[in-house]
């Protein structure tokens, strides 16, 4: 019988008492085969973290800073359940640390040196650790003691709880630096009052502070937020302009064998029986013998953290950067305006080889990082292990939902000023063999389908979106008799047609021979009835243009397109017979890397782009013999986006809506994780 006991870790007598009450009350409402609670008492949160890592306990609830400690080796714990605040309809699991300034003050984030600062308190998250962690490498050396470096960075501060004797500048705006509400500038409201009164130039608080202190929109409009990209935004745009997004209070467990499903089952049942306004005799979110025992008293319930989410993703790049800077205290030799090398994310073996050649030829401007799937690459860019990659529109959508931004677009048509004119897009088409003359868009049920990969634009999002509108369910593996859609579940009928060997079968990378545009067309040639690809795929792989044995004797005339009106047309008539227009592939990166990625890629394409005529000995960035490695092989240049610099603007309203509709059918664990951070 599987052990269904969750060993909860308590850090004080009062917590242990509440834990025992939790255990007893759960016993009274949960059947004997359901989850149960056992209590383990430790002296501190760090001891609890170690106990869970050592399998002496299973769960504890932690503040963000401790979630970071729990994640570090050798602990390797992960977030499994989040407390939420506010209402069930609009649950808040995170708050945003922000830098608030007066509207007319005219300076940016990179101009804070010499300004006067207001902090909630020394060592507090939004008021100190996050802003000072992010500013750490701009502080004057020596950076230890930290208080002295901060005092020398700002021209005056109020940092309640600081030592006013040793660091008088930190108490200059609030004599004495009192560590309670007796100090009018203490805490969130106090730090904001310090700014409001004109004592300070910037207040480091959380996003809700300004709303709690200024009920009137006209008053709030006198303030702005400083963004990390050295711009400003209105105070209600905190989701797009903050220093960090911070989880409030989180249950952690072991990454391996951590009982995360059992913990959720327990807490979900606990909130049903003993959550807000549920029971008189025991309340999960109440602490009669103290404050915030086991869970925060202000919590309203629990939400399951998506399984794909590790602590780094949960805490977010900015928060991890800030805390790491403070803990490790390491900075680059001397901050320069030079761009660091761009770490390109390469999918599996073949892309890695091309990336390595690029790295060698770039003489250090490009470095390479590998991942097995596109989603793994996106996750690596999110957490700073990689910086950039070029993505199909479907993945631009996921990357955008995960906070990444498009920076340059692939262009496929030769034009005089290619780099200045991003194209409208390419056409997503459905290709069939001419010989299968009875096949139309209206009778695809039961046929064999070939897709570039799950989640990609021409191969999946567009055709499956159209199909979903017809069949109103997500069981595409039942609609087609079999197929190859790399990235599907291995036991799905949509992996049956794939050709990869062993573990590579149906993998969404080049180890699966039927992956990508060329792969999906090959699948049609060898096994399938219909291939969902781009309009250039057939001409690029017929007439001897692809020398591979399977393709070298193919003729474009042997293939036709399915039109949405039930007719068929020759391949060259794609403009009048396509499923939809697809946004071009685009390079994505983190916001903080946008300028450098843009600059370095433009240099790189001038050296290795379409202007290179002989690719037999020279490195060519946009060539890989029909394999579309790193970039599509038909890329002519990477074009500026001008004002289309967010994923919504880049993809366009219509496509975003189409993918949004298909979200119900999404199997993307990354998309689930990212929408948890930003619904």
């Amino acid at each position: 019988v599987p052990d269904k006991t969750v060993r909860w870790c308590a850090v004080s007598e009062h917590e242990a008492t509440k834990c025992q009450s939790f255990r007893d009350h759960m016993k009274s409402v949960i059947p004997s085969d359901g989850p149960s609670v056992a209590c383990v008492k430790k002296a501190s949160y760090l001891d609890c973290i170690r106990a869970i890592a050592a399998n002496e306990a299973d769960a504890v609830t932690l503040d963000a800073g401790l979630v970071y400690d729990a994640y570090l080796a050798p602990n390797n714990l992960k977030p499994v359940v989040a407390e939420f605040y506010g209402s069930k309809e609009d649950p808040q699991t995170f708050y945003y640390a922000v830098a608030v300034v007066k509207k007319d003050s005219g300076f940016q984030m990179n101009q804070l040196r010499g300004k006067k600062s207001c902090h909630t308190g020394l060592g507090r998250s939004a008021g100190w650790n996050i802003p000072i962690g992010l500013l750490y490498c701009d502080l004057p050396e020596p950076r230890k003691p930290l208080e002295k470096a901060v005092a020398n960075f700002f021209s005056g501060s109020c940092a309640p709880c600081a030592d006013g004797t040793d660091f008088p500048q930190l108490c200059q705006l609030c004599p004495g630096c009192g560590c309670s509400t007796l100090n009018q500038y203490f805490g969130y409201s106090g730090a904001f009052k310090c700014l409001k009164d004109g004592a300070g130039d910037v207040a480091f608080v959380k996003h809700s502070t300004i709303f709690e202190n200024l009920a009137n929109k006209a008053d709030r409009d006198q303030y702005e937020l400083l963004c990390l990209d050295n711009t400003r935004k209105p105070v209600d745009e905190y989701k797009d302009c903050h220093l960090a997004q911070v989880p409030s209070h989180t249950v952690v467990a072991r990454s391996m064998g951590g009982k995360e499903d059992l913990i959720w089952e327990l807490l979900n049942q606990a909130q049903e029986h003993f959550g807000k306004d549920k029971s008189k005799e025991f309340q999960l979110f109440s602490s009669p013998h103290g404050k915030d025992l086991l869970f925060k008293d202000s919590a309203h319930g629990f939400l399951k953290v998506p399984p794909r989410m590790d602590a780094k993703m949960y805490l977010g790049y900015e928060y991890v950067t800030a805390i790491r800077n403070l803990r490790e205290g390491t900075c680059p030799e001397a901050p320069t305006d030079e761009c660091k090398p761009v770490k390109w994310c390469a999918l599996s073996h073949h892309e890695r080889l091309k990336c390595d050649e690029w790295s060698v030829n770039s003489v250090g401007k490009i470095e390479c990082v590998s991942a097995e799937t596109t989603e793994d690459c996106i996750a690596k860019i999110m957490n700073g292990e990689a910086d950039a990659m070029s993505l199909d529109g479907g993945f631009v959508y996921i990357a955008g939902k995960c906070g990444l931004v498009p920076v340059l677009a692939e262009n496929y048509n030769k034009s005089d000023n290619c780099e200045d004119t991003p194209e409208a897009g390419y056409f997503a088409i459905a290709v069939v063999k001419k010989s299968a003359s009875d096949l139309t868009w209206d009778n695809l049920k039961g046929k064999k389908s070939c897709h570039t990969a799950v989640g990609r634009t021409a191969g999946w999002n567009i055709p499956m979106g159209l199909l979903y509108n017809k069949i109103n369910h997500c069981r595409f593996d039942e609609f087609f008799s079999e197929g190859c859609a790399p990235g599907s579940k291995k036991d799905s009928s949509l992996c049956k047609l794939c050709m990869g060997s062993g573990l590579n079968l149906c993998e969404p990378n080049n180890k699966e021979g039927y992956y990508g545009y060329t792969g999906a067309f090959r699948c049609l040639v060898e096994k399938g009835d219909v291939a969902f690809v781009k309009h250039q795929t057939v001409p690029q792989n017929t007439g001897g243009k692809n020398p591979d044995p399977w393709a070298k004797n193919l003729n474009e005339k042997d293939y036709e397109l399915l039109c949405l009106d039930g007719t068929r047309k020759p391949v060259e008539e794609y403009a009048n017979c396509h499923l939809a227009r697809a946004p071009n592939h685009a390079v994505v990166t983190r916001k903080d890397k946008e300028a450098c990625v843009h600059k370095i890629l433009r240099q790189q394409q001038h050296l290795f782009g379409s202007n290179v005529t002989d690719c037999s000995g020279n490195f060519c960035l946009f060539r890989s013999e029909t394999k579309d490695l790193l970039f599509r092989d038909d890329t002519v240049c990477l074009a500026k986006l001008h004002d289309r610099n967010t994923y919504e603007k880049y993809l366009g309203e219509e496509y975003v809506k189409a993918v949004g509709n298909l979200r119900k059918c999404s199997t993307s664990s990354l998309l689930e994780a990212c929408t948890f951070r930003r619904p």
Epitope: H350, E351, L353, V360, S616, G617, E625, L629
Partner: nanobody
Framework: EVQLVESGGGLVQPGGSLRLSCAAS????????MAWYRQAPGKGLELVSG???????NYRDSVKGRFTISRDNSKNTLYLQMNSLRAEDTAVYYC???????????WGQGTLVTVSS
């Protein structure tokens, strides 16, 4: 058909030196970017160093200042001079010719370098 034959590996003490060679035939050696890779037991393949047709070189951080890549186009041979060897340099070393464009995998049999006292 491209053929790459690596040689020069062996057992060496920490702090010692070795010079690896890679003879290429059937390759457009003189105009290709060439590189040395290595694979330690139980680990993935990693780029050690590369050299372009014009002689520009690139090294992974852990070997910078200790290893030197060079090429002799007249002999169709690539070299890797390895000094101040460390235990973590133990691996099978392979050379590759990128002219094959990444997906016709041309790899030699490799040459084993063991750094141990």
């Amino acid at each position: 058909e491209v053929q790459l034959v690596e040689s020069g590996g062996g057992l060496v003490q920490p702090g010692g030196s070795l010079r690896l060679s890679c003879a290429a035939s059937g390759s457009i050696f003189s105009i290709a970017t060439m590189a040395w890779y290595r694979q330690a037991p139980g680990k993935g393949l990693e780029l050690v160093s590369g050299i372009t047709r014009s002689g520009s070189t690139n090294y992974r951080d852990s070997v910078k200042g200790r290893f030197t890549i060079s090429r002799d186009n007249s002999k169709n041979t690539l070299y890797l001079q390895m000094n101040s060897l460390r235990a973590e340099d133990t691996a099978v070393y392979y050379c590759t010719d990128y002219s094959s464009r990444y997906y016709h995998d041309y790899w030699g049999q490799g040459t084993l370098v063991t750094v141990s006292s």
